[in-house]
Structures are given as structure tokens and as C-alpha cells.
């Protein structure tokens, strides 16, 4: 498949597989305990550099947070230390181990007699929310062409089943906040916005929480707008040409325009020995313009047959639309047929077979812009 600008832009490298949801450990610690998480290398092989992450954010070592390649210790744990922890390979961001940690108010070794109630809140069946596929949560930036649809997803789990809510730029986000509304699917952990517009740009945060903790993920949405512009002409076209007397020549001009373009081919001429009029605009003659039966494709080519020395000179492809005009020019050099052609001399003369690009400097440092008004003035000179 050929990929165009419509393909999504993401702020991360290619996705890598992570552990299955069943491999995620759910651990309970008491307030004041040391949280110890161990992540041995898979298969006993070399570990390589790793990074420890909590709720999607890299952990910074401190006096209380001790980070090692295979081990994480959080001393004097408090409720705020609850959350989803993972150990990842630094280079690939592959999730090696994933833990759902809950820190309870009572010490984990406490002798709470209310066993029935406690059974509901501790052990492997309970815990703070965690991402079910954390390796899919690394992409943060989404750039989408206007008028398309965006879906943000934050699939999570926990016990009890967490709730999900959405923020835009840090504030509660509801359907009435955008024209066209939003569609929420709590069972799919998703937010959908149809037919996005530039005002939808911003940061979107999903907040997933239950009584044991909260996790969040922020995505940035950019909406790509097609701003109206004057025609764009392909660089390097038309190209300068050198032709032998009596041969045929083609100039090409590739025009890109969202609005309907009007294409003309002009030849620069002299009037009374002058190339420009009193107001400084060039004298031109229109060689080719849109007619009833002319296609854009036909207008993008100017064909000169059986060229004479009079055909030598400067040619301009002029394209205009409702926004404005663009033009590119090229030169035609006509050489005598019988003359033995030599390579360019030190002065830079053009020889047959070479398309020597004549720079703005060569042309005296100025390229004249021919306006629509100029065209009306100089059409028939």
C-alpha cells in the first residue's frame, strides 16, 4: 500500500509486543512498608538497560525510590504509591514485567479480624487500575486531517472494575463542549469524535480509577487543515532547454492547486527594444491558455515545433486561482544546425544535450512577477 499524508502521525517508534494480561502481578502492601518489585531477565538471558515506569511516567531515583536494572524498591510506601508499575527495556520500550500495586492504609501484616470484608479488598483478585495492554499506550501524538474521525482508547482493568472519564486540556470533557458531540463507549474504554475540526486540537486525558487508585493517559491531537493557497508549481519545471534549429521542444509545468487553476504559457518579448514596460512589468505574449476543450494536462505542456532563432528566449508558466498567482520561467537556446557543438566554455555557454539551469543571478538577480493586471495590460504586445 502506498502511504500518503493521510496516514496517522505518531510520536513513537514501531510497536513491540509485551506480556499478556495474565502475566501482570497484583500486589498489596501496607502503608509504611517497602514496596519491592523484582523483574528477572526473560529466559535468564542478559537484561540490557531498563527503565521503571509508574502509571506511564518514568520513575526518578531518590532516597525513597531505589531503582536497579532488575529491582525496584519504594521505601515507606503510602497510598500515593499505588498504581501500575512496569519494567521496560530502555531501547525497545518492551514491557518485561508489569505489576499492579496497592498500598493499603493498614500495615500488610496487620491482624484485622474482619476477614470477610478484607477478602474483598486484598489478594490477587483486587487492585488498582492498570492498562491491559501497556505497550500500546506509548503513542501520544495523533495528527489527523480535518473531517476525519478520531478515537482515543484507554483499555484498563482492576478490581473493582474502574470507571473512566475524559478531560480536554485538563478540564472535564462533555459532548456539549463540541459541535457534533462526542461518543463514549465505556465498555471499550473509548472516546470518539467525528468529523474533527481545528478547534478539536488539544490534550485529551483519560482518567481510569477505582477505590484503590487512579491511572491516566494524555494524548495530543493535532488537526491538519488544508489552508487555501495559490497554485504550487513543481520545482525545476519548466526546465531550460537547448535545441538545434528546426527541432521540436517541449516545456513542462506541473501545477498543484485545490481551487480551479487557470494556466497560461507566456513568451517574453521586446517592444521597441525594451523587455519591460514603463511600469517595470515585462512584455509578454500569450502562447497558450485555457480553452473550451483544453484539459489541465494539455496546458501543463508547451510544445514548440520546428524552432527558429526567433523562438529563443524566456518562457513563463503562469498559474492562477482564486487565491493568487504563481509562475516559473525557463530559457530556450536555439543553436544553428550545421554548427559543430562543443562543451561549455569557461564563460558557461550552453551546449547541445545539456540543460543548464540559469540562476536568478544569471538573470540579473530579479525574476519579474506578472500579475493578473499585468496580463491584461500586456497580452497583445
Amino acid at each position: 500500500e502506498s502511504l500518503g499524508t493521510e496516514q496517522r502521525v505518531v510520536g513513537r517508534a514501531a510497536e513491540v509486543p509485551g506480556p499478556e494480561p495474565g502475566q501482570q502481578e497484583q500486589l498489596v502492601f501496607g502503608s509504611g512498608d517497602a514496596v519491592e518489585l523484582s523483574c528477572p531477565p526473560p529466559g535468564g538471558g542478559p537484561m540490557g538497560p531498563t527503565v521503571w515506569v509508574k502509571d506511564g511516567t518514568g520513575l526518578v531515583p531518590s532516597e525513597r525510590v531505589l531503582v536497579g536494572p532488575q529491582r525496584l524498591q519504594v521505601l515507606n510506601a503510602s497510598h500515593e504509591d499505588s498504581g501500575a508499575y512496569s519494567c521496560r527495556q530502555r531501547l525497545t520500550q518492551r514491557v518485561l514485567c508489569h505489576f499492579s500495586v496497592r498500598v493499603t492504609d493498614a500495615p500488610s501484616s496487620g491482624d484485622d479480624e474482619d476477614g470477610e470484608d478484607e477478602a474483598e479488598d486484598t489478594g490477587v483478585d483486587t487492585g488498582a487500575p492498570y492498562w491491559t495492554r501497556p505497550e500500546r499506550m506509548d503513542k501520544k501524538l495523533l495528527a489527523v486531517p480535518a473531517a476525519n474521525t478520531v478515537r482515543f482508547r484507554c483499555p484498563a482493568a482492576g478490581n473493582p472494575t474502574p470507571s473512566i472519564s475524559w478531560l480536554k486540556n485538563g478540564r472535564e470533557f462533555r459532548g456539549e463542549h463540541r459541535i457534533g458531540g462526542i461518543k463514549l463507549r465505556h465498555q471499550q474504554w473509548s472516546l470518539v469524535m467525528e468529523s474533527v475540526v481545528p478547534s478539536d486540537r488539544g490534550n485529551y486525558t483519560c482518567v481510569v480509577e477505582n477505590k484503590f487508585g487512579s491511572i491516566r493517559q494524555t494524548y495530543t491531537l493535532d488537526v491538519l487543515e488544508r489552508s487555501p493557497h495559490r497554485p504550487i508549481l513543481q520545482a525545476g519545471l519548466p526546465a531550460n532547454q537547448t535545441a538545434v534549429l528546426g527541432s521540436d521542444v517541449e516545456f513542462h509545468c506541473k501545477v498543484y492547486s485545490d481551487a480551479q487553476p487557470h494556466i497560461q504559457w507566456l513568451k517574453h518579448v521586446e517592444v521597441n527594444g525594451s523587455k519591460v514596460g514603463p511600469d517595470g512589468t515585462p512584455y509578454v505574449t500569450v502562447l497558450k491558455t485555457a480553452g473550451a476543450n483544453t484539459t489541465d494536462k494539455e496546458l501543463e505542456v508547451l510544445s514548440l515545433h520546428n524552432v527558429t532563432f526567433e523562438d529563443a528566449g524566456e518562457y513563463t508558466c503562469l498559474a492562477g486561482n482564486s487565491i493568487g498567482f504563481s509562475h516559473h520561467s525557463a530559457w530556450l537556446v536555439v543553436l544553428p544546425a550545421e554548427e559543430e557543438l562543443v562543451e561549455a566554455d569557461e564563460a558557461g555557454s550552453v551546449y547541445a544535450g545539456e540543460q543548464k539551469l540559469i540562476s536568478e543571478e544569471d538573470l540579473g538577480g530579479e525574476q519579474k512577477l506578472i500579475s493578473e493586471e499585468d496580463l491584461h495590460h500586456h497580452h497583445h504586445h
Epitope: 500500500e1 502506498s2 502511504l3 500518503g4 499524508t5 493521510e6 496516514q7 496517522r8 505518531v10 510497536e15 495492554r133 500500546r136 499506550m137 503513542k139 501520544k140 495523533l142 489527523v144 486531517p145 480535518a146 473531517a147 476525519n148 474521525t149 478520531v150 478515537r151 482515543f152 482508547r153 483499555p155 463507549r185 471499550q188 470518539v192 468529523s195 494524548y219 488544508r226 485545490d258
Partner: antibody, heavy 127, light 107 residues
Framework: EVQLVESGGGLVQPGGSLRLSCAAS????????ISWVRQAPGKGLEWVGR????????NYADSVKGRFTISADTSKNTAYLQMNSLRAEDTAVYYC????????????????????WGQGTLVTVSS | DIQMTQSPSSLSASVGDRVTITCRAS??????LAWYKQKPGKAPKLLIY???FLYSGVPSRFSGSGSGTDFTLTISSLQPEDFATYYC?????????FGQGTKVEIK
């Protein structure tokens, strides 16, 4: 009002060529894509291909790859389906449909949805 | 290519009936599934996208569900204008593929 109008269908001999047009109006042609879908008489729907006019990026079904070419002229808000080396099995009603993407960071694909369709144009390949 | 199989191929029902059409994918397509309705001689119309999202302007009696390989289109109370052929279509894989269609006829 969003409108898509196909034209260019007709009778053509096997091995021949035909160019279908899809004139779009009522929406920003350069923001979304155009898909072509065909339906043989009495049969189901078959996706033919898709273009995103702004980039010119195209995708085709294997059954038409190398024979059919989709293009677009953004200045005319028109998409085209150039069909060469036509076969009897290409006989069908050809629909063009506005196509938008559902962009989702969580997955590795873009879901494409065809929300507005033209009325269709019949192409008959027969000797 | 991902094969989409609809069942039943046709069904007869009365106005007011609850109708369920299923669509099975030959491999996981996540929720990337759309449902279209087509009347004879007319172009298809989008009903549901992303398995369960009702397209704007479509009556709420239509609903979609499912993910992975098994999907369902439900019409809660069949109306006269609902007698048509329904197609499912996936677009996770290339190419996009349609089911063979389910024709809903008047009993």
C-alpha cells in the same frame, strides 16, 4: 448537501478501456478519500480501491491491480477510475463513495468508512 | 484476504419483529467493522461503523455489537423501509472486504 455523481459507464469490448468519473460536491474534497466499489449483477459488494486526493496515495484490490488506476483532480473535485484490459468479470455497477478514516493510536491501522455513495454507473464488458 | 461470512443469507420477518444478523471474520478485526443497508437498484447506505457506533441520521432501532471475529447487527423493531440487503465490511486488513449479504424479506 453531500453529493457524488458517477459517469462514464457503458458497453466495452473485452480488452478495451473505459474511464469513470466521480464528481463530488457539498464537502471538502481534499480532506477525505474516495473509494470505488463495484457490484456485479445479482451479486454482493466488492471494494475496488481508494484514493486520498491531497496526497494521491492509492490502494487497490488484487483483482484490479495493474489494470485499474484511480486518480483525482482536486481543482475539479473529481475522482477517476481508469479501467484498462477489461474482462467480462469486470461487468458491474461501479459506485464511488466518500471515505473517511478513523484514526486510533491504539491500533496499527486506519479504519476506513464509506459514508456517502453515488448512484452508480453500469459497466458492461461484452463482445 | 480476510473473509467475512454473514448468516443467515436471507430471512423472512414481519413488521415489528426483532431481527439479528451475524457476521464472522476469518481473523481478528478488532472493532473495525461497518454495516451497510442496500435496497434494490440503489446505492448502499452506512448504518454502523466501528462495530457499535450508529452513524448520524440512522434510526436508533439499529444497533451493532461485537469485536474480534464475531459481530451482530440488530434491528429492534423492523419497519417497512428496513426490508433490504445488509452487508458487513471490515477494514483492518487490506483489502477491505464485504460479507456476502443478508436479504431481509417480508414474511
Amino acid at each position: 448537501e453531500v453529493q457524488l455523481v458517477e459517469s462514464g459507464g457503458g458497453l466495452v469490448q473485452p480488452g478495451g478501456s473505459l474511464r469513470l468519473s466521480c464528481a463530488a460536491s457539498g464537502f471538502t474534497f481534499t480532506s477525505t478519500g474516495i473509494s470505488w466499489v463495484r457490484q456485479a449483477p445479482g451479486k454482493g459488494l466488492e471494494w475496488v480501491g481508494r484514493i486520498y486526493p491531497t496526497s494521491g496515495s492509492t490502494n487497490y484490490a488484487d483483482s484490479v491491480k495493474g489494470r485499474f488506476t484511480i486518480s483525482a483532480d482536486t481543482s475539479k473535485n473529481t475522482a477517476y477510475l481508469q479501467m484498462n484490459s477489461l474482462r467480462a468479470e469486470d461487468t458491474a455497477v461501479y459506485y464511488c463513495a466518500r471515505t473517511y478514516g478513523i484514526y486510533d493510536l491504539y491500533v496499527d491501522y486506519t479504519e476506513y468508512v464509506m459514508d456517502y455513495w453515488g448512484q452508480g454507473t453500469l459497466v458492461t464488458v461484452s463482445s | 484476504d480476510i473473509q467475512m461470512t454473514q448468516s443467515p443469507s436471507s430471512l423472512s420477518a414481519s413488521v415489528g419483529d426483532r431481527v439479528t444478523i451475524t457476521c464472522r471474520a476469518s481473523q481478528d478485526v478488532d472493532t473495525s467493522l461497518a454495516w451497510y443497508k442496500q435496497k434494490p437498484g440503489k446505492a448502499p447506505k452506512l448504518l454502523i461503523y466501528s462495530a457499535s457506533f450508529l452513524y448520524s441520521g440512522v434510526p436508533s432501532r439499529f444497533s451493532g455489537s461485537g469485536s474480534g471475529t464475531d459481530f451482530t447487527l440488530t434491528i429492534s423493531s423492523l419497519q417497512p423501509e428496513d426490508f433490504a440487503t445488509y452487508y458487513c465490511q471490515q477494514s483492518t486488513g487490506h483489502p477491505q472486504t464485504f460479507g456476502q449479504g443478508t436479504k431481509v424479506e417480508i414474511k
